[in-house]
Interface confidence: medium
Amino acid sequence: QEGDFPMPFISAKSSPVIPLDGSVKIQCQAIREAYLTQLMIIKNSTYREIGRRLKFWNETDPEFVIDHMDANKAGRYQCQYRIGHYRFRYSDTLELVVTGLYGKPFLSADRGLVLMPGENISLTCSSAHIPFDRFSLAKEGELSLPQHQSGEHPANFSLGPVDLNVSGIYRCYGWYNRSPYLWSFPSNALELVVTDSIHQDYTTQN
């Protein structure tokens, strides 16, 4: 990384948690001095090129499509910029996860799913037949990897004190430390509703 330049960004245009055979679009921030942008996957500390874009004067941020997602395409991605023959800059890294490689865990709650702000709820993710050593809890619609992780089995995720932003549909995934980008099928979904008017009648549609 050169001098005091800010690190260019890399981002997924949709969720980085991708079902087997699904697709995702990756965007590399354009930097003025680069004549070539390459998307690289980092496997075992080795870089492998996934795609490249030559710079055009009218170009916006270069985009790359990863389709037919599978175990080999899951992992850490980085944009590599060629500044000159022997000069490079690199973006931050992006982690892509593939789901559907193991059977699904089961997600349950320790109380009703309609809450008032400030209340607590615990979600439990368990798998009776598959000995996962890690679980992740994901909220539908989020564009980053789930922040909630647990190494317990079953995994308890404490949400709270909750605010209105906690409302949403949650699923959990199981995975193994040795293969952190290969996740299970999603669990059953639980919809949490946080409302400051508990008298409303909440019904959820599938």
Partner: antibody, heavy 116, light 107 residues
């Protein structure tokens, strides 16, 4: 095109063990799990177990003590081993590729007869 | 284990008919059900997963419906190639369990 093909011994003596190989093509075992299912003559289907793409296994608890499933990703082969066979283990044994937690593609099956 | 009760066990129907096969699970399986077809002398083929979704290449005359513990497979305008055995299978829990099968025969 996705294909699975089972190969087994045909005849097994009672109390002996069974080994069946499922050789797959058209997909990678690092991306898809493989189930084993059997069907005794004139009877229904029974799920035996699965080896997931990541390598872990899930078994039918009724058979777990004598069942083992493994694989060799590089050879595109999945292996079923069952110990202490009895006559009621006589069945057609199938392997099937997992898809969305279910069975999408099946092999033709291999008939295993347990008899002295 | 979840018990899958499939009916009827056999039925005689004519070309062009519409038929429905039902499966009842011993508990709510939340659409975690699939349907399989086995043609005479052939292996099995997946038709439907997650209750209603057609596997690739399956004709649209096949459809699945249901919720909770009760599900059905409907075949409209039966064609000669549809005469086969059909099975439901649940994957809400381990072990996976199958219905007893339905044999479709030509009347």
């Amino acid at each position: 095109q996705v294909q699975l093909k089972e190969s087994g011994p045909g005849l097994v003596a009672p109390s002996q063990s069974l080994s069946i190989t499922c050789t797959v093509s058209g997909f990678s075992l690092t991306s898809y799990g493989v189930h084993w299912v059997r069907q005794p003559p004139g009877k229904g289907l029974e799920w035996l177990g699965i080896i997931w793409a990541g390598g872990s296994t899930s078994y039918n608890s009724a058979l777990m003590s004598r069942l083992s499933i493994s694989k060799d990703n590089s050879k595109s082969q999945v292996f079923l081993k069952m110990n202490s066979l009895q006559t009621d283990d006589t069945a057609m044994y199938y392997c099937a590729r997992d898809h969305y937690d279910l069975f999408a593609y099946w092999g033709q099956g291999t008939l295993v007869t347990v008899s002295a | 284990d979840i018990l899958m009760t499939q009916s009827p066990s056999s039925m005689s129907v004519s070309l062009g008919d519409t038929v429905s096969i039902t499966c009842h699970a011993s508990q709510d399986i939340s659409r975690n059900i699939g349907w399989l077809q086995q043609k005479p002398g052939k292996s099995f083929k997946g038709l439907i997963y997650h209750g209603t979704n057609l596997e690739d290449g399956v004709p649209s005359r096949f459809s699945g419906s249901g919720s909770g513990a009760d599900y059905s497979l409907t075949i409209s305008s039966l064609e000669s190639e549809d005469f086969a055995d059909y099975y439901c299978v649940q994957y809400a829990q381990f072990p996976r369990t199958f219905g007893g099968g339905t044999k479709l025969e030509i009347k």
